[in-house]
Each structure stands twice: as structure tokens, then as C-alpha cells.
């Protein structure tokens, strides 16, 4: 049978051959009648056999780390008749390892963040060298982690390439850091090999700064005619974290006057000082306001360094503005009874220059050829005035400044014409009526009204009576309705057309003013030929117009 | 898990190179124990293969492309590639790029395979 | 170099019959360095066997292989529709590594 041991050879070996073993047949008695064959990959080119002795050699240098093991055939045959001395056979020759490759890093580069302010013993990341050497082969391929770089701040777990933080970090006063973690295999022995990678730690922010005005005062200027909402300044605080931690948020601390509000700009992170209310130069012209800022998110673990907000003082200097004159009330509303002469007093305005120069102010009434008005701001009629034409004039007053004729403040003014009585009252109609030839006595003939100008009082009341003559002729009667209308009626049986074919009719109406003013009015009665039923038969033509209810004019 | 990507030409003119890439991804090309390997399939004909590289830049031809055919390795972007020069009508094929266990020589995983036509 | 010849050219059976494919080598190679390998159309090779009855991970065991020195088998006990494809046995013990020419496995 075959003889053999298990074959190695040793990776990297330099010479130009290399005993690896002997393959032999038990039946062999080295008289060199045998040949040896090596058959299969690498037979000839990486390894040969001595064809007497069946000693096999390396020669070429082997890398174990390509390959580890070849399987080759064997033969041996008896030369003096050709024929297998032995069977073919497989064997095997391991390629024995040295520590010719260093620990590397595979998975570079690394990189990690971890939360700046961890506390030691936090795990950042873990880093891990192959080595291409047998692991079964003593410690060629066993590793030990180290920190080149990173102290006092990381620490690498030695067996496993873990690092963890050692020492807390600031992010404000460094952002990132660079460790160096050595592998050596031979588990760190002498003849190790070693390899390195970088770590690139980036501390991430976390909310331990609060935001923090840089300025105690601020000064500000607002001009007095600035609208309320309108932005008068910028306010800033700086806060060491970044992003989300360093969004604030600002606010009034302080404003006794309730004048001003803070906004923030989320963009710029700004505080914008806003106008809440109006002011004043004339009323004050500074203002003291405290702000305070806070960030926008902190975590309740985090509220130690946050106990107590920023604040900032801020000083508003008003700006004064050249205001127009300052009328004292909104508007006016005054009385003059109608009827008075041109020149009347009919009232006073009155402005004033708001502004601390106190202008003197003119005065000028728009469009109105009834009033004047002069410096004094009195208003005086330059017509007399009928309520019955304009019971009511609006009138718009003008005040001007005096050293500044483009400061102009207008108000309404109303003047009411007071009523008196000065007019009498009359017909509300022209009248004119008939009566038939065959009336009897206490016929209706009319019913009349009456109208008055004048403004009543509480309520008009007329009074109707006949003139003295009238009721001397006693034709006719009047008698009054006392709700301002009377009746005309006939006061005798008959009448003759022929003989007395109209009737004029005088008739005092009086009204309930004081004085009294009474009026007298003429109202026509004509006579006409009726039939027994009353139509009329034969009147003039006018007269049978108005019979059929008609008006002409 | 390990999986490979051919990449390169699909038409090559006669007489000039065909150069193939082949991109490994999921493992380092830098591992121990593996070659990598060119194999290619004429259209409706069996697999010849063309050769295998070591990561640190050994060689393995097939005698029969030897004279035509270089590979080279690039572990900085875990690749490999192929280059056959002189190219001829008869070198249109699928050509495959493939992993080999180094001790006992079987292919696996494969990329999945690129046709490059050889025409004027 | 090593040939390996594969038979039959083309094998026709029918789901639920069992297949016996043949690669037969030029000399002796080691059962270690022979692998047997899958192809359907448009697809590139897949691994089934290696060290010649070591079934490739994620292989059902309806394939096996067997043989040794000369003469390996690839047996699949029941054909399942998708077996269907063309197979190649390939040797490593000898340079150049060399592919048989390939087994059709049709649909009867």
C-alpha cells in the first residue's frame, strides 16, 4: 500500500524548491525499479515529484491566503512492466500559515455621532479588522484594539473594537473628533503586524445652552405718526447650540405702557420690536421695555440650563412729528334761530398745534357764502338766515398751521337754523266751489285745510273763522274741525244764479304760534242751475269742471 | 450575500479590444480563499473559461486566450476586469464574471452576464 | 487539459420521472474539484453540486451527485417543471478548468 504522512508546506518560502514529503509504496525496495507520477492541478508547475524516491518539493512560492490546500493524484509503476504498482490515489497538501498579512480595516471609513454631554461608557461605534491569516493557526489572525488618538475623551474595548466615550465632550468647544484605532494580531506579541483606521466622531447638539442677549440696552427710535403693527427694530440673542436647539423665542418681560409687543423672526431668529398702541412725542417721548428670550424646545432633562431667561433692556425714543392742528372736538353742532341779522354769532371752533412749537392756527370755512369764520375760530352769519330755505348747513372748517400752511385738519360743522314764527298759515290748496240754486241751509259746500311753513313747536293748530264782513253776509258759516281742517257750509235756503252768480269768501286762519300770525284766505263759491238730484244743469264751463272734480291750472 | 456585475461594451469591432468590468458588491474583493473569475458562452454553445485573479494581482489564464487576454484587479473600487485584444467574430459571446472557491475551483455566485457583439 | 463528456445530449422526460445525467472525464479528476451547475435560458449559470455530492446552499434535495475518479452522475429523483433547462458538469483538477458541453433537460 501507499505510505505517506500529512503534507505541508509553509506559505511565502523563498527557495527555489521545498521539501514537502515523501509518497511511497509499501512494496518499494529502493532498487529504483519504481516510478513515481504526480498527477492534477498544480502537479508540474507548483509542485514536482522525485520519480525514484516519490520525494515531492514546492517549487514555486506558495500563498496561503490564495489557497490552502491542493488535492493531487498519485501513481506508481513498476518500469520493468509498466504496470501500477499501486491503485491511484488522492492526497492532500495543506499550505501551512505564517503571519504575513497585517489586521485591515474592511468596512472604512468610519464615521459615528454621539450626543456631546454622554456620559462615559457610552458606545459610539464599533470598529472591526480582518486579518486574511488562519484563525485556527495560533494567533496569526487573533486581534487587539488600541487608541492611537482619542484620549482622554474615547476608549476601544481591546478585544472587541468597540469605542466608548471616556470623558464628556462640549460640542460648543469642539464639534468633532478624529481617533486612530490601531489592530495588531499575534494578539499584540512580539512580530505582530498592525493596521489602523480613522474615526471621524461628530457631536451631535443637545439643548445645554440658552440663548443670551449679547447687548444689555438696546435703543430704538419710533416716529409718533408710525402706524400700530409697524416694526421699529431688532433685537438678537445668540445661542451656543444649533438647529432646533437654538430656536428661541422672545417676549416683553416688562411694558408698564402695554405700548410695544415682541414677534420673533423663526428665520433669522431675531426678536422685531412691534408698535402695539399709538404714541405720542407730546405725551411721551421715551419708553423703557425689559425682553426676555427663551429657546422654543427644551427637554425636561435639560430645564438645568435654562432656569433663568436672558433678558435686555430696551430704551424707545420717540420721534416727534409735525402734526397738523388738533381740533378739540370731532366735530361741532350749533344754533342760530333764523331771521337774525347778517353778523349773528353762530358759534366757536377751536384747534391747537399738538406739536411743542404750538403754531398759531388759522381758520377758513370751505365753499359757504352764509358764514365766515376768523382767527379766533368764531363763526359769525353773513346773510340772514330762513329756516324755511336750509333748516340745516354742514359745513367743513379748516385750521391751518401758521409757520407750516401744509398742516391742514378739517371737522364737520353743523349749524341748525332754529325755527321762529314768521309765517302765517294758508290754504294747502286753491279752493274754489259751487253751490246749486236750490241749496238748502247747512249744505257742505267745502272742507278746507291749511299748511304753515314754520317748524311746529310740538304740533301746529289752526283756527278757522269767516271775516267780519263774512259772517255779517251770513250766506255762509264756517265751522272749524279742530284737527286743522274746517267746512264751509250754506247758511240759507237758495240761491240766484241770475242775480248772484259768485261768492268770494274771506277766511281768517290763525295758528298757534307766539305771536299768533293769522293769514286771509279767499275762497270762490260759484252758483249753478242743479236738477232735483243736485247734478248741475247750467254753470260755466269752468265751473262744471271743477263740479266733475277737476283742477285746472 | 455577494453579488457580481458585469459592465462594458456591447459592440466591439473586429481587430480592436473588448474591456469588461466587473463590480462586486456585498463583500470585498480583498477576502482570502477566492478567485475571480471570466468565463464566457458562445450563443447556443457551452461555458469556456478565460481565467481568474487573485486579489493581489496573481494570474490565471486559459492557454488557449493566454496570448489575448489580460485581468487586473482594482480592490480600491472592489472590482475586476477583462481585457481581449484582436478581437474576431468568434469572440462574440455572454461573458460571465463569477466567484471561485480557491481550493476546490467551483463558481458561484455569477453576475448575470453581458453580450458582446464582435462587428463591423 | 481535461474533457468532459456529458450524456445524453438531450434527455426528454416528463414531470415526476427521474433524471440521470452523465458527465464522464478524460482522466482522473478528484470528486472534490467536480461541480455540477443549472442554466435556463437568459440566465447565467446557477451552482447545484460541488465536491461531486455536496449539494450548493438553497438546492432542493431532489438533486444529488455521486461518482468518482472517471464517471459522475447527476440524478434529480422528480423532475419538477422549473428542473427543465440545461445542465454542464465542470472540473478543477486539472488546468485549464474545463466545462462539459451540456445536457438539454426537456418537456416530453
Known amino acids: 500500500g501507499w505510505v505517506w504522512n500529512q503534507f505541508f508546506v509553509p506559505e511565502e518560502m523563498n527557495t527555489t524548491s521545498h521539501h514537502v514529503g515523501r509518497l511511497r509504496s509499501d512494496l518499494d525496495n529502493g532498487n529504483n525499479s519504481f516510478q513515481y507520477k504526480l498527477l492534477g492541478a498544480g502537479a508540474g508547475s507548483t509542485f514536482i515529484i522525485d520519480e525514484r524516491t516519490g520525494d515531492i518539493y514546492a517549487i514555486e512560492k506558495l500563498d496561503r491566503e490564495e489557497r490552502s490546500l491542493y488535492i493531487l493524484r498519485a501513481q506508481v509503476i513498476d518500469i520493468t512492466t509498466g504496470r501500477a504498482v499501486e491503485p491511484e490515489s488522492e492526497f492532500v497538501i495543506k499550505v501551512s500559515d505564517i503571519n504575513d498579512n497585517e489586521p485591515k480595516f474592511l468596512d472604512e471609513p468610519y464615521e459615528a455621532i454621539v450626543p456631546e454631554m454622554s456620559p462615559e461608557g457610552t458606545l459610539v461605534i464599533q470598529v472591526t479588522a480582518s486579518d486574511a491569516d488562519d484563525p485556527s493557526s495560533g494567533n496569526n489572525a487573533r486581534l487587539l484594539y488600541s487608541l492611537l488618538q482619542g484620549q482622554p475623551y474615547f476608549s476601544v474595548e481591546p478585544t472587541t473594537g468597540v469605542i466608548r466615550i471616556s470623558s464628556k465632550m462640549d460640542r460648543e468647544l469642539q464639534d468633532e473628533y478624529w481617533v486612530i484605532i490601531q489592530a495588531k494580531d499575534m494578539i499584540g506579541q512580539p512580530g505582530a503586524l498592525s493596521g489602523t483606521t480613522s474615526v471621524l466622531i461628530k457631536l451631535s447638539d443637545v439643548n445645554d445652552n440658552k440663548p443670551i442677549f449679547k447687548e444689555s440696552l438696546y435703543r430704538l427710535t419710533v416716529s409718533e405718526s408710525a402706524p400700530t403693527g409697524t416694526s421699529i427694530g431688532t433685537i438678537m440673542a445668540y445661542d451656543n447650540d444649533i438647529g432646533e436647539n437654538a430656536e428661541m423665542d422672545y417676549s416683553i418681560e416688562e411694558d408698564d405702557s402695554q405700548t410695544f409687543d415682541i414677534i420673533t423672526n423663526h428665520e433669522t431668529q431675531e426678536g422685531i420690536v412691534i408698535l402695539k398702541k399709538k404714541v405720542n412725542f407730546e405725551h411721551q417721548n421715551h419708553y423703557g421695555i425689559r425682553a426676555k428670550v427663551k429657546n422654543h424646545h427644551v427637554d425636561e432633562q435639560l430645564m438645568k440650563y435654562h432656569t433663568e431667561a436672558s433678558t435686555t433692556f430696551i430704551k424707545i425714543q420717540v420721534e416727534d412729528v409735525d402734526e397738523p392742528p388738533l381740533f378739540l372736538l370731532p366735530y361741532y353742532i350749533f344754533e342760530i334761530f333764523e331771521e337774525t341779522p347778517q353778523g349773528s354769532f353762530v358759534g366757536v371752533v377751536s384747534a391747537t398745534d399738538p406739536d411743542n412749537r404750538k403754531s398759531p392756527i388759522r381758520y377758513s370755512i370751505t365753499r359757504s357764502k352764509v358764514f365766515n369764520i376768523d382767527d379766533n375760530g368764531t363763526i359769525t352769519t353773513t346773510n340772514s338766515l330762513d329756516r324755511e330755505i336750509s333748516a340745516w348747513y354742514n359745513l367743513s372748517i379748516t385750521a391751518t398751521e401758521k409757520y407750516n400752511i401744509e398742516q391742514i385738519s378739517s371737522i364737520p360743522v353743523y349749524v341748525q337754523v332754529l325755527n321762529i314764527n314768521d309765517h302765517a298759515p294758508e290754504f294747502s290748496q286753491y279752493y274754489e266751489s259751487y253751490v246749486c240754486e236750490n241749496a238748502g241751509s247747512g249744505q257742505v259746500i267745502q272742507t278746507i285745510s291749511a299748511v304753515d311753513r314754520d317748524e311746529s313747536i310740538e304740533e301746529h293748530h289752526f283756527y278757522f273763522n269767516l271775516s267780519v264782513e263774512d259772517t255779517n253776509s251770513s250766506s255762509f258759516t264756517i265751522i272749524d274741525n279742530q284737527d286743522n281742517t274746517a267746512v264751509i257750509l250754506t247758511n240759507r235756503t237758495g240761491f240766484n244764479l241770475q242775480e248772484e252768480p259768485i261768492f268770494y269768501i274771506s277766511i281768517l286762519i290763525a295758528d298757534n304760534g307766539i305771536p299768533s300770525l293769522t293769514s286771509t284766505n279767499t275762497l270762490t263759491i260759484h252758483v249753478c242751475d242743479c236738477d232735483d238730484s243736485g247734478s248741475t244743469q247750467t254753470c260755466q264751463y269752468q265751473e262744471l269742471m271743477l263740479s266733475m272734480g277737476f283742477k285746472t291750472e | 450575500q455577494v453579488q457580481l456585475q458585469e459592465s462594458g461594451p456591447g459592440l466591439v469591432k473586429p481587430s480592436q479590444t473588448l474591456s469588461l468590468t466587473c463590480t462586486v458588491s456585498?463583500?470585498?474583493?480583498?477576502?482570502?480563499?477566492?478567485?475571480w473569475s471570466w468565463i464566457r458562452q458562445h450563443p447556443g454553445k457551452g461555458l469556456e473559461w478565460i481565467g481568474y485573479i487573485f486579489y493581489s494581482g496573481k494570474t490565471y489564464y486559459n492557454p488557449s486566450l493566454k496570448s489575448r487576454v489580460s485581468i487586473s484587479v482594482d480592490t480600491s473600487k472592489n472590482q475586476f476586469s477583462l481585457k481581449l485584444s484582436s478581437v474576431t467574430a468568434a469572440d462574440t459571446a455572454v461573458y460571465y464574471c463569477?466567484?471561485?472557491?480557491?481550493?476546490?475551483?467551483?463558481?458561484?455566485?455569477w453576475g448575470q452576464g453581458t453580450l458582446v457583439t464582435v462587428s463591423s | 487539459e481535461i474533457v468532459l463528456t456529458q450524456s445524453p445530449g438531450t434527455l426528454s422526460l416528463s414531470p415526476g420521472e427521474r433524471a440521470t445525467l452523465s458527465c464522464r472525464a478524460s482522466q482522473s479528476v478528484s470528486s472534490s474539484y467536480l461541480a455540477w451547475y443549472q442554466q435556463k435560458p437568459g440566465q447565467a449559470p446557477r451552482l447545484l453540486i460541488y465536491?461531486?455530492?455536496s449539494r450548493a446552499t438553497g438546492i432542493p434535495d431532489r438533486f444529488s451527485g455521486s461518482g468518482s475518479g472517471t464517471d459522475f452522475t447527476l440524478t434529480i429523483s422528480r423532475l419538477e417543471p422549473e428542473d427543465f433547462a440545461v445542465y454542464y458538469c465542470q472540473q478543477y483538477g486539472s488546468s485549464p478548468i474545463t466545462f462539459g458541453q451540456g445536457t438539454r433537460l426537456e418537456i416530453k
Open positions: 463569477a466567484r471561485v472557491y480557491s481550493n476546490y475551483g467551483w463558481f458561484d455566485p
Open positions: 465536491g461531486a455530492s
Open positions: 456585498g463583500g470585498s474583493i480583498s477576502s482570502g480563499g477566492y478567485y
